[in-house]
């Protein structure tokens, strides 16, 4: 099985304890990790951090000691907008441009492949997205041909029917992709004005429409029927929360929220909580399960988080397992307990870790 | 109301080839998946296939998916069946049906009936 | 391709009485499965969707239940429109796959 882990570089920035650099990261954890995230400057791919070079360097010397492991670069994200990557996915020259200009740098700065992060093509951007991602993988047999190594190219998709539907032509784009990471996350936010898992596995005995499509088991499944194989798709688990602030005493799925969590102590993001910040959350809170979904949330004060621990975790693992998929995905290394100092376990990457044991069990 | 009214059915010889048609009414034709199901006389349902608004994809039983072709016309508001190389097992009632989106198919017609025979 | 066993093929019963019908799937399907009622003549009509959802209009005394490989159906308390055929569907994996269907006769 595949293990994708994502490690993004504005961890860096991180205060204290919370700040993640490559070099921190456990070179046998993964099969893949990818760098979250490149730019697009001029139509060519570039850098975005000031210092990415050089934790291109520190990321990619991890596979000396592990030559299995493979790191991609991903490009795009939430900072970089859609309309962006629409004006050059949309227009022939511009594509061309960027397509060339992706082999040079990822050979230069030792990767291995390409994830496509394009936070959400429109409903006019669909076939500018599968032609992008044909051209792409096209590019990349044809920069193998000298006898190297054939890049590899990835994408990372939007788990939300209606985005599947509106984005992506599923059958086609998984012809030309290598692995397909589906954001199994994020379903549920403060914009819903309930509290609400982000992340369930199954579908929760209350949910009518559309809630009875915002969980991992109706993505996946949606995915699979799109014509995605089963082989090529990942499934995406998070190592971070959802948070909210509760409008009155209900404090179950449901209840009333006045806005999103007040912000971690590192991550200093409203509504979001890395897993080592849950963990210390954790003390004096209580959890529960929601049992039907297979996953906790855990209650203190007026604060509510949703999040996945390492029996939700299995689960999931067993879940892609009886599916057949290709394996998981992790967003992200950075937002687990990277240094084993807050959950109390000793041990580093206690999320992930879980996740590749599962994988590994029989 | 949702109205699906299928067509075309009739005998054919084996070897043969029919094209089913199923009109549908009462919805926004183009936002839904559609399916093929038929059931041979006084034996089960039988899923054929289906295809999604877009026809971007087209899922079969892989036994029928080399003698059959499904398709569509969302502006005729018209979901078809191409039948080919027929044979006496494939005499049967053919329903289509509307999938919601829990993948159930909650609409039927009320199915055209094919019998193959010389 | 994901067999389904519908068991029994047929059964008799009296008005009033409960009645269960079990599927089997050959694999996990989790809760995607499907009840169907088919009445003589008539194309089907979906009863019950993901295992345990009542699809629109269906009266109460149908119910579903039962995750994985095994599930059940059950009606509580039979009236004479209800002895006809049942067909459960596993939409777990394509193709889609029916089981063979029950009859349900009067005593």
């Known amino acids: 099985y595949k293990l994708v882990c994502y490690y993004t570089s504005w961890s860096q920035y991180r205060e204290g304890d919370g700040s993640c650099f490559p070099d921190a990261l456990d070179r046998f954890l993964c099969t893949h990790i990818i760098y979250s995230f490149a730019n697009i400057s001029n139509d060519h791919i570039d850098t975005w951090e000031w210092n990415d070079v050089t934790l291109y360097g520190m990321l990619n010397t991890l596979k000396n000691r592990n030559p299995n492991l493979k790191t991609l670069l991903s490009v795009g994200g939430w900072n970089f907008g859609s309309q962006r990557f629409s004006k050059i996915a949309s227009n022939t020259q511009s594509r061309r441009t960027f397509i060339k200009s992706v082999p040079p740098f990822l050979r230069t700065h030792g990767f291995d492949g390409l994830d496509l992060a394009w936070l959400y093509p429109g409903r006019r951007d669909k076939q500018h997205f599968t032609t992008l991602i044909k051209e792409m993988k096209a590019e990349f047999i044809k920069e193998a041909q000298p006898g190297k190594k054939q890049l590899l190219l990835s994408a990372a998709l939007s788990a939300g029917k209606v985005t599947i539907d509106s984005s992506y032509d599923i059958a086609k784009i998984s012809q030309h992709l290598d692995f397909i990471s589906i954001m199994t996350y994020d379903f549920h936010g403060a914009w819903r004005g309930t509290t609400g898992h982000h992340s369930p596995l199954f579908r929760g005995q209350e949910d009518a429409s559309p809630d009875r499509f915002s969980n991992t088991d109706y993505a996946v499944g949606y995915m699979l029927r799109l014509g995605a194989p089963a082989s090529k798709l990942v499934m995406g688990i998070p190592t971070f929360g959802r948070s909210f602030t509760l409008a009155s005493s209900e404090t179950g799925v449901g209840a009333p929220i006045s806005g999103p969590g007040i912000p971690g102590r590192f991550t200093k993001e409203a509504g979001t909580l890395a897993y080592y910040e849950i963990c210390d959350f954790l003390r004096g809170a209580t959890v529960h399960r929601i049992l039907g979904q297979q996953v906790p949330y855990a209650t203190k004060g007026n604060q509510w988080v949703g999040y996945d621990d390492q029996e939700s975790v299995k689960s999931k693992v067993q879940y892609l397992k009886d599916r057949q998929l290709a394996g998981a995905m992790v967003w992200a290394l950075d937002l687990d307990d990277f240094q084993g100092s807050f959950c109390g376990q000793d041990l580093r990457f206690p999320l992930t870790n879980a996740i590749k044991d599962a994988l590994a069990a029989t | 109301e949702v109205k699906l009214l299928e067509s075309g059915g009739g005998l054919v010889q084996p070897g043969g080839s029919l094209k089913l048609s199923c009109a549908a009414s009462?919805?926004?034709?183009?936002?839904?998946?559609m399916s093929w199901v038929r059931q041979a006389p006084g034996k089960g349902l039988e899923w054929i296939g289906e295809?999604?608004?877009?026809?971007?994809?087209?899922n079969y039983t892989p036994s029928l998916k080399d003698k059959f072709i499904i398709s569509r016309d969302n502006a005729k508001n018209t979901l078809y069946l191409q039948m080919s190389k027929v044979r006496s097992e494939d005499t049967a009632l053919y329903y289509c049906a509307r999938p919601e989106d829990h993948f159930a198919m909650d609409y039927w017609g009320q199915g055209t009936s094919v019998t193959v025979s010389s | 391709d994901i067999q389904m066993t519908q068991s029994p093929a047929s059964q008799s019963a009296s008005l009033g009485e409960s009645v269960t019908i079990t599927c089997l799937a050959s694999q996990t399907i989790g809760t995607w499965l499907a009840w169907y009622q088919q009445k003589p003549g008539k194309s089907p009509q979906l009863l019950i969707y993901?295992?345990?959802s009542l699809a629109d209009g269906v009266p109460s005394r149908f119910s579903g239940s039962g995750s994985g490989t095994k599930f059940s159906f059950k009606i509580s308390s039979l009236q004479a429109e209800d002895f006809v055929s049942y067909y459960c569907q596993q939409l777990y994996s394509t193709p889609w796959t029916f089981g063979g269907g029950t009859k349900l006769e009067i005593k």
């Open positions: 993901a295992a345990t």
């Open positions: 009462g919805c926004d034709f183009s936002r839904y998946w």
């Open positions: 295809i999604n608004p877009d026809s971007s994809t087209i």
